[in-house]
Interface confidence: medium
């Protein structure tokens, strides 16, 4: 469970490995912030809707976020 | 590979303190979440906290609220705990384990160091 | 406070197939994922079966793991059983998030 409750950073652990496209309900990018100093990444999954924390800074993550991205604009009118 | 080594263990008397490391090797320590959990002799597994990869989100269990503390050197590949006001309850082994980075579940532990409260 | 009982021990002989139950109370057990870890005398606990049901890699896949919301638990399933699967076997998931909560255990013998 990679969350807190707190109003603080929300990520217990963060994860260099993308996450399936496929498995994924929603992705979401959580800019930095006076409550946290640092952008976090937050898969959620659907399965469970478990959400998983993805390394800003891994080169893996910013190639998925480039997918979802390319993906979103493609559906967009 | 992944290591975590437990030190600090000892013989404490009740109300004293006590404080438990953790060094751990072979993995990326500032991207992971650490738990401590204990076992007290004859007994069964007890989560005691958890730190988040940074520091800024530490959890404990109510057993151990307010009296312990989890930290974390991410300079040092170090996890802490400091153990104050110690009970003869809190007599246990003490795990230090590491939380998956892509997932929900413990991955790797270290081999515990005992820590016996009595007078 | 959400809570995992376990059966205190079970037994059985070499070959044979063994389940272990893991009831929960207090809440739903398939809110939030279930993780097996099995220790063995002397040693630190390792990780058989995590998110319900999969197995980590070197896991055999006589171990199996399975979810039944109507009983509201959690099950081990050790199929061809072996004496070096005698061992402590816990259930753990979550009381709320970050709360984790662990099974008081249960002790396999194989006779």
């Known amino acids: 469970v990679p969350l807190s409750r707190t109003v603080r950073c929300t990520c217990i652990s963060i994860s260099n490995q993308p996450v399936n496209p496929r498995s994924l309900e929603k992705l979401e990018i959580i800019p930095a912030s006076q409550f946290c100093p640092r952008v976090e990444i937050i898969a959620t999954m659907k399965k469970k809707g478990e959400k998983r924390c993805l390394n800003p800074e891994s080169k893996a993550i910013k190639n998925l976020l480039k997918a979802v991205s390319k993906e979103r604009s493609k559906r967009s009118p | 590979q992944v290591q975590l080594v437990e030190s600090g263990g000892g013989v404490v008397q009740p109300g004293r303190s006590l404080r438990l490391s953790c060094a751990a090797s072979?993995?990326?320590?500032?991207?992971?979440?650490i738990h401590w959990v204990r076992q007290a002799p004859g007994k069964g597994l007890e989560w005691v906290a958890v730190?988040?990869?940074?520091?800024?989100?530490?959890f404990y269990a109510d057993s151990v609220k307010g009296r312990f503390t989890i930290s974390r050197d991410n300079s040092k590949n170090t996890l802490y705990l400091q153990m104050n006001s110690l009970r003869a309850e809190d007599t246990a082994v003490y795990y230090c384990a590491k939380l998956r980075d892509n997932g929900e579940y413990l991955d790797y532990w270290g081999q515990g160091t005992l820590v016996t409260v009595s007078s | 406070n959400f809570m995992l009982t376990q059966p205190h021990s079970v037994s059985e002989s070499p070959g044979k197939t063994v389940t272990i139950s893991c009831t929960g109370s207090g809440g739903s057990i398939d809110r939030n994922y279930v993780q097996w870890y099995q220790q063995r005398p002397g040693s630190a606990p390792i990780t058989v079966i995590y998110e319900d049901n999969q197995r980590p890699s070197g896991v055999p896949d006589r171990f199996s793991g399975s979810i039944d919301s109507s009983s509201n638990s959690a099950s081990l399933t050790i199929s061809g059983l072996r004496t070096d699967d005698e061992a402590d076997y816990y259930c753990?998931?979550?009381?709320?998030?970050?709360?984790?909560?662990f099974g008081g255990g249960t002790k396999v013998t194989v006779l």
């Open positions: 730190i988040s990869y940074d520091g800024s989100n530490k």
């Open positions: 072979g993995f990326t320590f500032s991207n992971s979440g």
């Open positions: 753990q998931s979550y009381d709320s998030i970050n709360l984790w909560v």
